[in-house]
């Protein structure tokens, strides 16, 4: 049909970038390139109906459904979703194509369904059908990778039993400490399952799919390094594989390594050795201790010894169930308005936790850092000095943990006043919670020094705004003060703030703030 317009349907996926986390309005800023949805004419349908390819969206993802119309003249349009019509405002792009968009922010179950777009151009009318569903991630899993020895080869295979099939990569680093951070130039990534180069300083394997990324580090004892000041500890659950690598470098090949568990040499078949010469002609030896499926009796001190190095040990603890150990008592903090401060939680957990920080129903990303003593720490500094309740929540496959924090910001009270025909009220949010005084201004007391004590009702902390306490004081009006100016003052250790109210007839009252 010659009269039919050329139309294109596209899907734009928006990345909810972190700067918008915790902002309610945020139109997603960062977009990925549009995905063509085809938009084919639907056969055997009454009228002209185009059907876009089905769209599957992750929960909480933000998308735009967009139609580009190459037709002469103006167009008008209407979106219909679940029998409700939605506003539609076409505009024109640089190629003079009509552009119609439907933005869905933070996809939920209720936003899934059929979106119908009715377009009327000068030449013809037609309908475009989009079907939007939520991707079924209930069946998705992302499991922490584990290691296996490759049959008949000195190599490790990295396995992650996840759905959908994850991308597996080895993350290798040959320098010490901080320089082995993920984005450091010292870090090399290899997107493959098998690793032959097992002599590096730091070896991790990571698996990633739609659910995120999980990594496992190859636990290593380096006999050329001074031992940690605290005993290195490795936790595993019954049935998981155990891998410990012992590494030593010496000027020549004349040295050997051995593994012991509680003074007994490991059995044949539970270890294998590899050696190589490094660039400066020194000999590097590594000796792996491994158990394909650990039992409770594999718990104990594993000691790696050498004929040319001091021995070192690690404690392997086999648990039936994962755990999160931390103190869950709530903590209250009081800081100044410009004081630098971070909440922190120190915990020991296995398997590794997933965590969030929450304030005022908004979630913030949670970072965790391993400490030398086997503990990890998560800090939250992005409170922007907003008082209230902050919640740390952590979970792993077997355990959950929640800890509450209260942040109070020390500041001088700010007073707001309101009045009705029968009473005047003042509110303040300063901290520490303020005390109140009411004063009457009259000819006898032009400086408002005459204190009012009758009819005053103070309510401390009577309402919580995002966890922030507000204090109020109410003065019931009596004949003695009607028509006078009264002054309410809130004071705490940081200062005083007052508001003056004219007590006359109902209606708007002039308020004069004196600080």
């Amino acid at each position: 049909n010659q009269d039919l317009p050329v139309i294109k349907c596209v899907l734009i996926n928006h990345k909810n970038n972190d700067s918008s986390v915790g902002k309610s309005s945020s139109y997603p800023m960062v977009s990925e390139s549009p995905e063509d949805l085809g938009c084919a004419l639907r056969p055997q349908s009454s009228g002209t109906v185009y059907e876009a390819a089905a769209v599957e969206v992750d929960v909480s993802a933000s998308i735009t459904l967009q139609v580009l119309v190459d037709a002469p003249g103006n167009i008008s349009c209407l979106w219909v979703f679940k029998h409700s019509s939605l506003n539609c405002q076409p505009h024109f792009d640089l190629q003079n194509r009509g552009v119609v968009s439907m933005v869905i922010l933070k996809m939920t179950e209720t936003q899934a369904g059929e979106y119908l777009l009715f377009i009327q151009s000068e030449a013809t009318n037609y309908t475009i059908l989009f079907t939007v569903s939520i991707r079924n991630t209930l069946l998705y899993t992302l499991r922490r990778p584990y290691f296996r020895k490759m049959e008949n080869q000195d190599a490790l295979v990295c396995i992650s039993e996840s759905v959908p099939e994850p991308i597996v990569e080895w993350v290798l680093c040959d320098s010490q400490g901080e320089s082995c951070k993920e984005e450091s130039p010292a870090v090399v990534k290899k997107e493959e399952k098998v690793l032959h180069e097992l002599f590096g300083t730091d070896i991790r394997c990571c698996a990633r799919n739609e659910l995120g990324r999980e990594c496992t580090r190859l636990f290593t004892i380096d006999l050329n390094q001074t031992p940690q000041t605290t005993l290195p500890q490795l936790f595993l659950k019954v049935g998981e594989p155990l891998w410990i690598r012992c590494k030593a470098v010496h000027v020549n090949h004349g040295f050997g390594l051995t593994w012991e568990l509680e003074n007994k040499a490991l059995e044949e078949g539970n270890y294998f050795e590899m050696s190589t010469y490094s660039t400066n002609r020194t000999m590097i030896r590594i000796l792996f201790a491994f158990v394909s499926s650990v039992a409770r009796n594999d718990t104990g001190y594993y000691t790696c010894s050498s004929s040319k190095h001091p021995s070192q040990s690690a404690l392997v603890t086999i648990v039936e169930k994962g755990f999160i150990n931390a103190t869950n008592s709530s903590e209250d903090y009081e800081i100044d308005q410009y004081e630098e401060f971070c909440f922190s939680v120190r915990f020991k957990a296995y398997p590794q936790i997933r965590c969030t920080w929450t304030f005022s129903r908004k979630s913030f990303p949670c970072e965790q850092k391993g400490l030398d003593n086997g503990y990890s720490i998560s800090k939250f500094c992005n409170h922007k000095h907003q008082p209230g309740e902050y919640i740390f929540h952590a979970e792993n496959d077997d355990a959950q943990f929640t800890k509450m924090f209260t942040l109070n910001i020390r500041r001088k009270p700010q007073v707001l006043a309101e009045a009705s025909a029968s009473q005047a009220s003042c509110f303040s949010d300063g901290y520490p919670l303020p005390s109140w005084t009411w004063k009457k201004c009259s000819d006898k007391s032009p400086n408002c020094t005459e204190e009012i004590t009758e009819g005053v009702w103070n309510r401390k902390a009577n309402r919580k705004v995002f966890g922030q306490w507000v204090s109020s004081s109410t003065l019931n009006m009596s004949e003695a003060i009607k028509g006078f100016l009264v002054k309410c003052c809130a004071y705490n250790s940081l200062g005083t703030s007052c508001e003056t109210i004219l007590l006359n007839s109902p209606g708007p009252f002039p308020f004069i703030q004196d600080n």
Epitope: G256, N263, S305, K308, S311, Q312, S313, L315
Partner: nanobody, 111 residues
Framework: QVQLQESGGGLVQAGGSLTLSCTAS????????FSWYRQAPGKQRELVAF???????IDVESVKGRFTISGDNDKNTAYLQMNGLKPEDTAVYYC?????WGQGTQVTVSS
């Protein structure tokens, strides 16, 4: 849980001698896993001497011929015999055994 108890530190004149002992409790004892480290103020902890997996006493270059590590399996104790002490040997001396550290004993060598 292994407990390590060091003793024998003190103040000594240059050229003098001291013997440090380290007694282990709470674990089956094997002299092969003992080592001595030291930490001078503002410096990293460094290896001084150890007993290798084949029972040989090994000391590092800076103390060669002056320090000797030995042990007594019956007493669950390792020793560090220090002769010809120099001011640069001043440090806190720690013993290490099976992942655990002693609390340290101060050795001060005056010139």
């Amino acid at each position: 849980q292994v407990q390590l108890q060091e003793s024998g530190g003190g103040l000594v004149q240059a050229g003098g001698s001291l013997t440090l002992s380290c007694t282990a409790s709470g674990s089956t004892f094997s002299i092969n896993h003992f080592s001595w480290y030291r930490q001078a103020p503002g410096k990293q902890r460094e290896l001084v001497a150890f007993i290798s997996s084949d029972g040989v006493s090994i000391d590092v270059e800076s103390v060669k011929g002056r320090f000797t590590i030995s042990g007594d399996n019956d007493k669950n104790t390792a020793y560090l015999q220090m002769n010809g002490l120099k001011p640069e040997d001043t440090a806190v001396y720690y013993c290490y055994y099976r992942g655990f550290w002693g609390q340290g004993t101060q050795v001060t060598v005056s010139s």
